[in-house]
Amino acid sequence: LQDPCSNCPAGTFCDNNRNQICSPCPPNSFSSAGGQRTCDICRQCKGVFRTRKECSSTSNAECDCTPGFHCLGAGCSMCEQDCKQGQELTKKGCKDCCFGTFNDQKRGICRPWTNCSLDGKSVLVNGTKERDVVCGPSPADLSPGASSVTPPAPAREPGHSPQ
């Protein structure tokens, strides 16, 4: 015998209290698949969360973060404070990247500048706290029309970089 509940479409639930009639999901609830015996409560985007997509009878609400914060976790389960480029978030708030590291994003950690010599290349542009070092082509890569690669003088001021 076919389960009568299997005929209940998304947006409804199989109401055991009403002889397994398909009843619409109550306000602020949803069912995203058919044959459900209950509807799920809609997610509410409160506080630092804001609504990106309203809840409907067939799909949950989706949240993102208010300006100054960014999403973390699956489905934006958390909001984390933004920092400026060239900074990272610590327990004491946003702190500038240390010399020799960079962060080109408003989230994440400061990372060491690229070590060009690992690829047998020279430094084409020095790093800053907002931007990574740029490595020049190795001598074998140079050809007419390409940029010359004279390593610049070492950076004298604290610097760091992006991404």
Epitope: F102, T114, N115, R131, D132, V134
Partner: antibody, heavy 127, light 110 residues
Framework: EVQLLESGGGLVQPGGSLRLSCAAS????????MSWVRQAPGKGLEWVSV????????YYADSVKGRFTISRDNSKNTLYLQMNSLRAEDTAVYYC????????????????????WGQGTLVTVSS | QSVLTQPPSASGTPGQRVTISCSGS????????VTWYQQLPGTAPKLLIY???HRPSGVPDRFSGSKSGTSASLAISGLRSEDEADYYC???????????FGGGTKLTVL
């Protein structure tokens, strides 16, 4: 020689879905950031999304956030763009682009630009 | 409207020097590297300048890039008919967490 070949474009109705693919060859695919960039007929270039190879991080333009999903299969040297809830304004030629700066040696590709491009695939959203 | 502002058109005669500007803000050009692309009619874009002022192998030294503050420029000297194309600036924008392109400049060689 870097080669990028997009496929999967076509005509789709508003609200519909499409999945674009980009087959890459001629370089170590797993070492580079990859982007999708689009160009509406007669208009300029618009960056759509990027995916990093090392941590799998993804970023999207506000115009497609929540509707498009970028992914990659390094074992198949292929980049994907899943496009849902398509709108008329998504009509464009979609280019697959390789960033310069091989990871993990290079920490950030943003300096090196997009140094390899496919020929593009046309997506038309119309009823 | 693009985050990066370019003049929609520019023109010059063969042999002339032409400059294309690209204006942004501290969240993009001001703290990040600028790249330039050339798009010939009916073709895919091609990287012309990376890291503000550096040319990839194979790009003629007639093309040069520069940056000052929140603006960047592409200069083309000894203009040739084959330089007729659309030119785009681009960079990373940390506040948007994404790449941004200028609106493009159509260069006509008269």
């Amino acid at each position: 020689e870097v080669q990028l070949l997009e496929s999967g474009g076509g005509l789709v109705q508003p609200g519909g879905s499409l999945r674009l693919s980009c087959a890459a060859s001629g370089f170590t695919f797993s070492g580079y950031d990859m982007s999708w960039v689009r160009q509406a007929p007669g208009k300029g270039l618009e960056w759509v999304s990027v995916i990093y190879p090392d941590d799998g991080n993804t970023y999207y333009a506000d115009s497609v956030k929540g509707r498009f999903t970028i992914s990659r299969d390094n074992s198949k040297n292929t980049l994907y763009l899943q496009m849902n809830s398509l709108r008329a304004e998504d009509t464009a030629v979609y280019y697959c682009a390789k960033h310069g700066g091989q990871k993990p040696t290079t920490k950030s590709s943003s300096a090196y630009g997009m140094d390899g491009w496919g020929q593009g695939t046309l997506v038309t959203v119309s009823s | 409207q693009s985050v990066l502002t370019q003049p929609p058109s520019a023109s010059g005669t063969p042999g002339q020097r032409v400059t294309i500007s690209c204006s942004g803000s501290s969240s993009n050009i001001g703290n990040n590297y600028v790249t330039w692309y050339q798009q010939l009619p009916g073709t895919a874009p091609k990287l012309l300048i990376y890291a503000d002022s550096h040319r990839p192998s194979g790009v003629p030294d007639r093309f040069s890039g520069s940056k000052s503050g929140t603006s960047a420029s592409l200069a083309i000297s000894g203009l040739r008919s084959e330089d007729e194309a659309d030119y785009y600036c681009a960079t990373w924008d940390y506040s948007l967490s994404g790449y941004v392109f200028g609106g493009g400049t159509k260069l006509t060689v008269l």
